[in-house]
Interface confidence: low
Amino acid sequence: VPDKTVRWCAVSEHEATKCQSFRDHMKSVIPSDGPSVACVKKASYLDCIRAIAANEADAVTLDAGLVYDAYLAPNNLKPVVAEFYGSKEDPQTFYYAVAVVKKDSGFQMNQLRGKKSCHTGLGRSAGWNIPIGLLYCDLPEPRKPLEKAVANFFSGSCAPCADGTDFPQLCQLCPGCGCSTLNQYFGYSGAFKCLKDGAGDVAFVKHSTIFENLANKADRDQYELLCLDNTRKPVDEYKDCHLAQVPSHTVVARSMGGKEDLIWELLNQAQEHFGKDKSKEFQLFSSPHGKDLLFKDSAHGFLKVPPRMDAKMYLGYEYVTAIRNLREGTCPEAPTDECKPVKWCALSHHERLKCDEWSVNSVGKIECVSAETTEDCIAKIMNGEADAMSLDGGFVYIAGKCGLVPVLAENYNKSDNCEDTPEAGYFAIAVVKKSASDLTWDNLKGKKSCHTAVGRTAGWNIPMGLLYNKINHCRFDEFFSEGCAPGSKKDSSLCKLCMGSGLNLCEPNNKEGYYGYTGAFRCLVEKGDVAFVKHQTVPQNTGGKNPDPWAKNLNEKDYELLCLDGTRKPVEEYANCHLARAPNHAVVTRKDKEACVHKILRQQQHLFGSNVTDCSGNFCLFRSETKDLLFRDDTVCLAKLHDRNTYEKYLGEEYVKAVGNLRKCSTSSLLEACTFRRP
């Protein structure tokens, strides 16, 4: 019989008392085969973290700073359940730390030196740890003691709770450094008042502070937020302009064997029976003998943290950077305006080989990081382990939802000013063998399908989006008799046609022979009835253009396109017979790396782009014998995006809507994790 006990860690007598009450009340409402609570008492949160790591306890609820400690080796804990605030319909699990300024003050984030600052309090998250952590490497040396470095960075501050004797500059803007509401500039509202009164130039608070203090929108309009990319935005746009997104209060557990499903089952049942306004005799979110015992008193319920989400992703790149800077206190030798090498994310073995060759040729401008799937690469870019990669539109959507931005677009047509003219896109098509003359768009049910990969544009999002509108369900593996859609569940009929061996079968990378455009076409040639690819795929792999044994004798005339009106047309008539226009592949990165990735890639394509005529003796960035490694092989150049610099603008409203509709069918664990952080 599996042990269904969750050992909750309590950090005080009062918490232990509430935990026992929690245990007893859960016993009275949950059947004997359901989850149960046991209580473990420790002296501090850090002791609880160690106890969970050592398998002496299973769960504890922590503030963001402690979630970071819990994640660090050797603890290796992960977030499993989040408390939420506000309503069930619009649950708030995060708040945003922001830098608020007056509208006409005319400076940016990188010009804060010498300004006057308003803080909620020394050592507090939004008011001190996050802004000072992010500014850490800009502080004058020596950076220890930290308060002295901050005092020398700003021309005056109000930082309640600071030592006014040792660091008078930190209390210069407020009447003393009082650490309570008696100090009119203490806390969120106080720090904002310090700005509003004109004492300071910038206030470090949380996003809701300005709404709580200014009911009138016309008044709020006189303030702006400083963004990390050295721009400003209106205060409403805090989701796109903040210093960090911070989880409020989170249950953590072991990463391996951590009982996360059991913990969720327990807490979900607990909130049903003892949540807000549920029970008189025991309340989960109430602390008669103290404050915030086990859970925050202000919490309204729990949400399950998506399993794909580790602590780094949950806390977010900015927060982790800020806290790491404060804790470790390490900075690059001397801050320079020079760009650091761009860490390119390479998928599996083949891409890594090409990337290493690029790295050598780039003389230190490009470094390589490996991952097994596109989603793993996106996650690495999010958390700073990698910086950039080129993605199909479907993954640009996921990357965008995860906070990444497109920076350059692949262009596939030769033109005089290729780099200045991003193209409208390519065509997603459905290809069949000419010999299968009875096959049309309207009778695909029960046929064998070939897809580039799940989540990709031409191979999945467009055809499956159109199909979804017809069949109104997500059971595509029932619709087709079998197929190869790399990235599907291994036991799905959509992995049955795939050719990868062993663990590589149906993997969404080049170890699966039927992966990508060329792979999907090969799947059609050898096994399938229909392939969903781009309009250039057939000509690129027929007429001897692909020397591989399976392709070298293929003839374009032996294939036809399925049109949405139920007719068929020759391959060259793709402009009048396609499923939809697809956005070109694009390079994505983090916002903070945008300028450097742009600069370095433009240099690299001038050195190794399509102007290199002999690829046998020289490194060519856009060539890989039809395998589309790192970039599509038909890329002519990487083009500037001009104002299409967000994933929505880049992909276009129609495509974003199509993928949005298909999200009901999404199996993307990363998308689930990212929409948890930003619904």
């Epitope: 506000g86 309503s87 619009d90 708030q92 509208k103 006409d104 996003h207 809701s208 709404f211 709580e212 009911a215 009138n216 929108k217 016309a218 008044d219 709020r220 309009d221 006189q222 209106p234 409403d236 746009e237 805090y238 619904p679």
Partner: antibody, heavy 120, light 113 residues
Framework: EVQLQESGPDLVKPSQSLSLTCTVT?????????WHWIRQFPENKLEWLGY???????NYSPSLKSRFSITRDTSKNQFFLQLNSVTTEDTATYYC?????????????WGQGTTVTVSS | DIELTQSPSSLAVSVGEKVTMTCKSS????????????LAWYQQKPGQSPKLLIY???TRESGVPDRFTGSGSGTDFTLTISSVKAEDLSVYYC?????????FGSGTKLEIK
């Protein structure tokens, strides 16, 4: 295209509560902007009632604050008006509308309005 | 609350004529920091909801024909229709969003002779 559509009862008795729904299509009410209720009396006078911001923050006209509230259901992309203890003076056409970030309170999208009569 | 007085309350003109209507505010709607006037104009055709024409006193909303012009500053504002068309038959309202709560004028009804 952003569209707003009001719905609710045509007739309400005095002292009862009035509940109206605004259903928004083409834009998520949590993604940005403020979402307002405005009414127009039979003699054509327009009166602003209040808004709910995409963040969930609300703001009401001082003259109605005590008996008026706005809530929302983000899963259905709807926001609601509740006006308690209605009198015949509350007979009007009720509109929902959206404003821009810039300028605030200048309503760029309106519903077609729903007419409510308060009468016994 | 800020009061807005519109005049005339109604006027009748022939197609092709120029029309001017005014909106007076009980206090200045000019915000000195950004030099913007927090005033909007709306058009309401019979049986329809109001439609935003002008904001910041003089900025035309996209899609609004250029025969509609907003002008003025501080407390006195004007909406001009340079050459009236039959479809302009409407009530025109001004609205201030300088100060909470936002308020509307009582409207000017434009009739076609």
């Amino acid at each position: 295209e952003v569209q707003l559509q009001e719905s609710g009862p045509d007739l309400v008795k005095p002292s009862q509560s009035l509940s109206l729904t605004c259903t928004v299509t083409g834009y998520s009410i949590t993604s940005g902007y403020s979402w307002h209720w405005i009414r127009q009396f039979p003699e054509n006078k327009l009166e602003w009632l209040g808004y709910i911001h995409s963040s969930g923050a609300t703001n009401y006209s001082p003259s109605l604050k005590s008996r008026f509230s706005i809530t929302r259901d983000t899963s259905k992309n709807q926001f609601f008006l509740q006006l308690n203890s209605v009198t015949t003076e509350d007979t009007a056409t009720y509109y929902c509308a959206r404003d821009g970030y810039s300028p605030p309170y200048a309503m760029d999208y309106w519903g077609q309005g729903t007419t409510v009569t308060v009468s016994s | 609350d800020i009061e807005l007085t519109q005049s005339p309350s109604s006027l009748a003109v022939s197609v092709g004529e120029k029309v001017t209507m005014t909106c007076k505010s009980s206090q200045s709607l000019l915000y000195s920091t950004n030099q913007k006037n927090y005033l909007a104009w709306y058009q309401q055709k019979p049986g329809q909801s109001p439609k935003l024409l002008i904001y910041w006193a003089s900025t035309r909303e996209s899609g609004v024909p250029d025969r509609f012009t907003g002008s003025g500053s501080g407390t006195d504002f004007t909406l001009t229709i340079s050459s009236v068309k039959a479809e302009d038959l409407s009530v025109y309202y001004c609205q201030q969003y300088y100060s909470y709560p936002p308020t509307f004028g009582s409207g000017t009804k434009l009739e076609i002779k």
